[in-house]
Every structure is written in structure tokens, then in C-alpha cells.
């Protein structure tokens, strides 16, 4: 038997991802355990393998069908149960019934790309995936800027409060290297939480020309 | 401002059939579900039919096999075909859609309509 506190959380990406976090203080390593969701409403049912991210955590993403389908609605409850073997049973570990969106995550921002580099400024845009159809153009990003010599922890957070799909950062030094991220979250949902940070764009602002004051 | 207009419902016999409509109309919205709901007096209100994105029909255990719900998306209507209807069926009949505006999810009712079935 595995004893210890249980903390089962989900997310739904919006369209046909569910993520999944197990974790279970005293957990026996080698057990195979997975996430087995079943909806309400819907005729599929769907499973993933649960793998270890850490010592005494595991995770899986429940595939629900192709990345842009509409898979689930506001009405939809998906009860979701970590199953884990038990010689030839399967034991129930920690169960939710899991309404998708009141628990949104969105997938990070993709194709981030400089659109234009100056000395002290620079145009970055990027692009939303898997966003449901329902939110429309009613979301909001933030973004932070890594300068040399700090953490992206110490990056202040830029908001935009509104579907802008690009940024035009400042008062930048010049020939300076620089990193930058950005995140994206849904109005909707009680539980809803900031999509990870997208992979960090570099980029370096233009050197000043010489001998102009700039 | 959205508004939800009902129609079809009235008074009909037992084992007769009925047809109801509801039109959802308003400023900009995209709907993910649309259903019909109904009222006896002294009692709660209860899911009768609703139908989600997706095609996934939900039905009251009292109804199912007798009542058929349609959704147009397009038309933003929602229909409710009733059939073998018994007096146990009569109350009044909400309409009831999902709405998202501006990026938020909220429910809308409609007036009701009554359906009446006698013995």
C-alpha cells in the first residue's frame, strides 16, 4: 500500500490536451501508474502513461485528438483517476471530476521572431497555439526582458491586456545582448493559470554608429 | 443585450406531440451549448435535453427515447421534438445557451413557454 499525502492537478489546454501532475509523497518508483479520463458526455474515453518528473512526481498529457479539435465545452466533466498496478489489479490513487474550463492552461506562445532591431529598440512578435475559438480575440500576455548580468526572476513583467501578438521593447542599450519570453492566459476559468513561458528568443540591438551621439 | 425567445409550446393531449423553438439573438456571441430545462410548480427546474459543440446530447432520465433535441448553430435555434407526451410532462419549458462574450462563459435563459398536457 502507498501512504502519504496525494495532490492530483489537471489542465486543459482549450481545445484537445489535458496535462497531468501526480504527486504522492512515499510512492513506490517502479509502480506503473496512468491518468485515465472518462467524460460525462462524450462517447471516447482517453489514457496516458504517467512518467516521473521528479523524485515523487509524475505526469502525462491526455491526448483528446487532433491538436486544433474542440474536444470539450463548459458543460463537459471529465472524471479523472490515477490508476496505478497493483500486481495484476489496478488501484485508484486519487480521482477528480475535472470541468475543463475552470482549469485552463494554455499551450506557451510559439514562433517568436525579431521583427525589427535598432539600437535602442526592438519589434518582436510571436503566435498563439491551440487556442479555443471561444475566447475570440479576449486574451491577455506578459512579457519580460532578460538584460545582461540579471535573472529572469529580476525581468519586470510587461502586460498586454488585449490579443497583441507583438511588442516593441525600448530604452535598450545598444550592441547588448538580450532574451525575451512571453506568456498567455484566458479571462475564463476559476482555476485558470498562465500558459508556460515560451522558449526564450535572443536577439542583439544594433551597435551605435560611430561617432553620433545616440 | 442577448435575448432568448421560446415558441411552440401549448395545450395538447396524451400521446400527442409538440415542437418547441428557441432563438438566441443579441450582440456578438459564440454559443457551446444550447438546451431546454423545465418547471413544475413546487419543484426544481430540471434538465430536459441539451446538446454541446461536438454533437453530445444530454437527456433527462424521464425523457429520453420520447424527446429529440436539434441544434442549428448557424441559426443560433435550438429545438425540442416531444412525443408520447403524458401529463407528467407538463410545466413550464425553459430555454437555456451557453454563451461566451469577450472572452467569458455565461449562461442565458429565456422566458419559458408552457406546455400543458392533458388526460
Known amino acids: 500500500a502507498v501512504n502519504g499525502t496525494s495532490q492530483f492537478t489537471c489542465f486543459y489546454n482549450s481545445r484537445a490536451n489535458i496535462s497531468c501532475v501526480w504527486s504522492q509523497d512515499g510512492a513506490l518508483q517502479d509502480t506503473s501508474c496512468q491518468v485515465h479520463a472518462w467524460p460525462d458526455r462524450r462517447r471516447w474515453n482517453q489514457t496516458c502513461e504517467l512518467l516521473p518528473v521528479s523524485q515523487a512526481s509524475w505526469a502525462c498529457n491526455l491526448i483528446l485528438g487532433a491538436p486544433d479539435s474542440q474536444k470539450l465545452t463548459t458543460v463537459d466533466i471529465v472524471t479523472l483517476r490515477v490508476l496505478c498496478r497493483e500486481g495484476v489489479r489496478w488501484r485508484v490513487m486519487a480521482i477528480q471530476d475535472f470541468k475543463p474550463f475552470e482549469n485552463l492552461r494554455l499551450m506557451a506562445p510559439i514562433s517568436l521572431q525579431v521583427v525589427h532591431v535598432e539600437t535602442h529598440r526592438c519589434n518582436i512578435s510571436w503566435e498563439i497555439s491551440q487556442a479555443s475559438h471561444y475566447f475570440e480575440r479576449h486574451l491577455e500576455f506578459e512579457a519580460r526582458t532578460l538584460s545582461p548580468g540579471h535573472t529572469w526572476e529580476e525581468a519586470p513583467l510587461l502586460t498586454l491586456k488585449q490579443k497583441q501578438e507583438w511588442i516593441c521593447l525600448e530604452t535598450l542599450t545598444p550592441d547588448t545582448q538580450y532574451e525575451f519570453q512571453v506568456r498567455v492566459k484566458p479571462l475564463q476559468g476559476e482555476f485558470t493559470t498562465w500558459s508556460p513561458w515560451s522558449q526564450p528568443l535572443a536577439f542583439r540591438t544594433k551597435p551605435a554608429a560611430l561617432g553620433k551621439d545616440t | 443585450q442577448v435575448q432568448l425567445v421560446e415558441s411552440g409550446g401549448g395545450l395538447v393531449q396524451t400521446g400527442g406531440s409538440l415542437r418547441l423553438s428557441c432563438v438566441v439573438s443579441g450582440s456578438h456571441f459564440i454559443s457551446d451549448v444550447m438546451g431546454w430545462y423545465r418547471q413544475v410548480p413546487g419543484k426544481q427546474r430540471e434538465l430536459v435535453a441539451d446538446m454541446a459543440d461536438g454533437g453530445s446530447a444530454k437527456y433527462g432520465d424521464s425523457v429520453k427515447g420520447r424527446f429529440t433535441i436539434l441544434r442549428d448553430s448557424v441559426k443560433n435555434t435550438v429545438y425540442l421534438q416531444m412525443s408520447s407526451l403524458n401529463p407528467e410532462d407538463t410545466g413550464v419549458y425553459y430555454c437555456?445557451?451557453?454563451?461566451?462574450?469577450?472572452?467569458?462563459?455565461?449562461?442565458?435563459w429565456g422566458q419559458g413557454t408552457q406546455v400543458t398536457v392533458s388526460s
Open positions: 437555456k445557451a451557453g454563451l461566451w462574450i469577450t472572452g467569458r462563459h455565461s449562461d442565458y
